[in-house]
Amino acid sequence: GITIPRNPGCPNSEDKNFPRTVMVNLNIHNRNTNTNPKRSSDYYNRSTSPWNLHRNEDPERYPSVIWEAKCRHLGCINADGNVDYHMNSVPIQQEILVLRREPPHCPNSFRLEKILVSVGCTCVTPIVHHVA
Amino acid sequence: GITIPRNPGCPNSEDKNFPRTVMVNLNIHNRNTNTNPKRSSDYYNRSTSPWNLHRNEDPERYPSVIWEAKCRHLGCINADGNVDYHMNSVPIQQEILVLRREPPHCPNSFRLEKILVSVGCTCVTPIVHHVA
């Protein structure tokens, strides 16, 4: 990896080894100010592989609310507006980092956790395996 | 929000107010063990709105490497394998949390940051604005 020259103004830390505990400021800096506010707002409905968004809430996690996409159909919507099984709707998944309260119910102590979330759906050509 | 009963075994913290600094264990717990290994592995190529993945590296960020999707075409791939501009390939975007080293170059001090990443692409019906 890339070695980072240490800033002499860094806070002290006792343990330099992994697994390590670090200080994190939860005052979130949002880098998304210049993004198009419409973004993917209505793509879930206009897509040929439309999806619904389900609210997943967990007070022991930060962020506590995550939205999960579920594809509406197994097939994709064709030009006639019908579900066509010659194509497949599939979820696009991404691993994201969240903070898990550890020990449980502690407001100021967390552990990083990787979770897999479905962000939306896309329409793919199926892999066809014919019987010999 | 939901109030969480405080665990008496929690570490002490001086500042109980937001913005607050918390302790985070960077030994990542991976909750994705039972997921289908096939996942989105080749969807980027098989999709009617295919995309390329671009590596975004920033040593001041944790995770330092994030993969960004860029749609290959403005239109979508039709049944003949051609790009059809009656439909649009659009990126599915998601806000994710990352840790930003703060002050810069400090190995043990971070600030939460929200960034917008493109995870993949989906094919949507365009919104047609007719001239009056």
Partner: antibody, heavy 120, light 111 residues
Framework: QVQVQESGPGLVKPSETLSLTCTVS?????????WNWIRQPPGKGLEWMGY???????SYNPSLKSRVTISRDTSKNQFSLKLSSVTAADTAVYYC?????????????WGQGTLVTVSS | IIVMTQSPLSLPVTLGQPASISCRSS???????????LHWYQQRPGQSPRRLIY???NRFSGVPDRFSGSGSGTDFTLKISRVEAEDVGVYYC????????FGQGTRLEIK
């Protein structure tokens, strides 16, 4: 308890249009299910004809696509089947059925079926 | 269109004995999302079909545990561990990975 009930004429003349309605009780047709039409010719197996989903999207059997239309009336909690240009081969028991649509995609409730005979 | 082929077409079984029905599809039933949408239904004489098994091996609620499903890809099996009199009827496999289709049915009767 969910119930689905087919209704419509039991006799249709060749070349005419067969029309059936399914009335759903105990479940809104706009909740997360697909509403199917499946038929069974006398003494034969089952044939899927098509469905309309909770969101109003339809899907049809490719072999029947040009002749079949499925629609719904959410105010009456009903969905309907129209099959045009019928022949004697369309004589069958017609079932309406609810399909669990939340990553199961299997029919979980069937109507009792209605026999439609195509004859002049 | 996917062709579902069941065997045997007729299955005489002694009460209390096991029974097994095979279903083969002309194409793999694994969807691009990794799931397999293969289901089983029972149709008793003079009745509508009734749900049994969904997605290869999951029993619908209320279905006795003597019914079990297995298989993958293109080859699937429905097993009844001990046949009872009420199990008489026609059993259909069905797939919804592609445009939905049904097998031609297997008639189970008591010897």
């Amino acid at each position: 308890q969910v119930q689905v009930q087919e209704s419509g004429p039991g006799l249709v003349k060749p070349s005419e249009t067969l029309s059936l309605t399914c009335t759903v009780s105990g479940n809104s047709i706009t909740s997360y299910y697909a509403w199917n039409w499946i038929r069974q010719p006398p003494g034969k197996g089952l044939e899927w004809m098509g469905y309309i989903t909770y969101s109003g999207t339809t899907s049809y059997n490719p072999s029947l696509k040009s002749r079949v239309t499925i629609s719904r009336d959410t105010s009456k909690n009903q969905f309907s089947l129209k099959l045009s240009s019928v022949t004697a081969a369309d004589t069958a028991v017609y079932y309406c059925a609810r399909e669990e649509y939340d990553d199961i995609y299997a029919v979980d409730y069937w109507g009792q079926g209605t026999l439609v005979t195509v004859s002049s | 269109i996917i062709v579902m082929t069941q065997s045997p077409l007729s299955l005489p079984v002694t009460l209390g004995q096991p029974a097994s029905i095979s279903c083969r599809s002309s194409q793999s039933l694994v969807h691009s999302n990794g799931n397999t949408y293969l289901h089983w239904y029972q149709q008793r004489p003079g009745q509508s079909p009734r749900r049994l098994i969904y997605k290869v091996y999951n029993r619908f609620s209320g279905v006795p545990d003597r019914f079990s499903g297995s298989g993958s890809g293109t080859d699937f099996t429905l097993k009844i561990s001990r046949v009872e009199a009420e199990d008489v009827g026609v059993y259909y496999c069905s797939q919804s990975t592609h445009f939905p289709t049904f097998g031609q049915g297997t008639r189970l009767e008591i010897k």
